[in-house]
């Protein structure tokens, strides 16, 4: 994602929201959308949502994926709908190749 500076009147995007912070809502509005995967005791927990404040997501979105966590961010209405965060393949530290295959 480009390291663009926050605007004075930042554009807000509609994002899919799935996870612990969503309550009963299935969407949220923010300056960035995200899709994340975290490993909790060996179980895959997928979440989607938004960062209301640009700075809030800036560091998170730039964190490279680790064996236990991956986050992918985007800007655009519903841009996280078809994004599934993926853990890095062994020996790599970037998303794009899955560590798993659905069989």
């Amino acid at each position: 994602m480009e390291d663009e500076k926050p605007k004075v009147n930042p554009k807000l995007y509609m994002c899919v929201c799935e996870g612990l912070s969503c309550g009963n809502e299935d969407h949220c509005e923010g300056q960035q959308c995200f899709s994340s995967l975290s490993i909790n005791d060996g179980f895959h927990v997928y979440q989607k949502g938004c960062f209301q404040v640009y700075e809030q997501g800036k560091m998170t979105c730039k964190t490279p994926p680790s064996p236990g966590q991956a986050v992918e961010c985007c800007q655009g209405d519903w841009c996280n709908r078809n994004i599934t965060a993926q853990l890095p393949t062994k020996g790599k530290s970037f998303p794009g190749t899955q560590n798993f295959h659905l069989e």
Epitope: E18, L20, N40, G42, F43, H44, V45, F100, H101
Partner: antibody, heavy 118, light 106 residues
Framework: EVQLVESGGGLVQPGGSLRLSCAAS????????MYWIRQAPGKGLEWISS????????YYPDSVKGRFTISRDNSKNTVYLQMNSLRAEDTAVYYC???????????WGQGTLVTVSS | DIQMTQSPSSLSASVGDRVTISCKAS??????LNWFQQKPGEAPKLLIY???SLQTGIPSRFSGSGSGTDFTLTISSLQPEDFAIYFC????????FGPGTKVEIK
């Protein structure tokens, strides 16, 4: 077809050790996290361990941490559970299970019975 | 740790009945919940994952619902092969199973 076959159960004295094995087939073993779950006779289910694809990350609840060790051999398509310092309350059927990334514990083995008694 | 409770602990029903089983979490687990069926001498079998998704090969009479702390497994028309114990399972944090609900023949 996914198959998980546990072995290694039996009768062991309190304080003793046992190693369980789970032989997997029907899927690309090295691509999946694996799990052990147990069930005491007539009781509920308890998750006791998980291991990631290359064996570099392992997870345990407090009830077995420091006594049980999960490991895997991807060349043999097998996951293991080394159980030390066994107690009477560890008596249970031990199941091996696998997930797909978005479907936890989708497949289970038939289980192997471990009895800890003097 | 997140505690899971199920109600009722057992129930008696007849073939063709609509059966509902409740599972409650002690804190928010969103939809990170599965339902399993277990028959005597057998391993648990996955019925529902992610609260409401039907596992492949499971009859459509089984359905799940809920989010947050309250979840329900429904069997729309009980069949003879459905008499078993049903467990819920949460994997949001510190994976835990519910104590089970035994469905018996009336």
């Amino acid at each position: 077809e996914v198959q998980l076959v546990e072995s290694g159960g039996g009768l062991v004295q309190p304080g003793g050790s046992l190693r369980l094995s789970c032989a997997a087939s029907g899927f690309t073993f090295s691509n999946y996290y694996m799990y052990w779950i147990r069930q005491a006779p007539g009781k509920g289910l308890e998750w006791i361990s998980s291991i990631n694809t290359d064996g570099g990350s392992t997870y345990y609840p407090d009830s077995v941490k420091g006594r049980f060790t999960i490991s895997r051999d991807n060349s043999k398509n097998t996951v293991y559970l080394q159980m030390n310092s066994l107690r009477a309350e560890d008596t249970a059927v031990y199941y091996c299970a696998k997930s797909t990334p978005n479907i936890p514990l989708a497949y289970w083995g038939q289980g192997t019975l471990v009895t800890v008694s003097s | 740790d997140i505690q899971m409770t199920q109600s009722p602990s057992s129930l008696s029903a007849s073939v063709g009945d609509r059966v509902t089983i409740s599972c409650k979490a002690s804190q928010n687990i969103y939809k990170y919940l599965n339902w399993f069926q277990q028959k005597p001498g057998e391993a648990p079998k996955l019925l529902i994952y992610y609260s409401n998704s039907l596992q492949t090969g499971i009859p459509s009479r089984f359905s799940g619902s809920g989010s947050g702390t309250d979840f329900t497994l429904t069997i729309s028309s009980l069949q003879p092969e459905d008499f078993a114990i049903y467990f819920c399972f949460q994997y949001s944090s510190g994976p835990t199973f519910g104590p089970g609900t035994k469905v018996e023949i009336k």
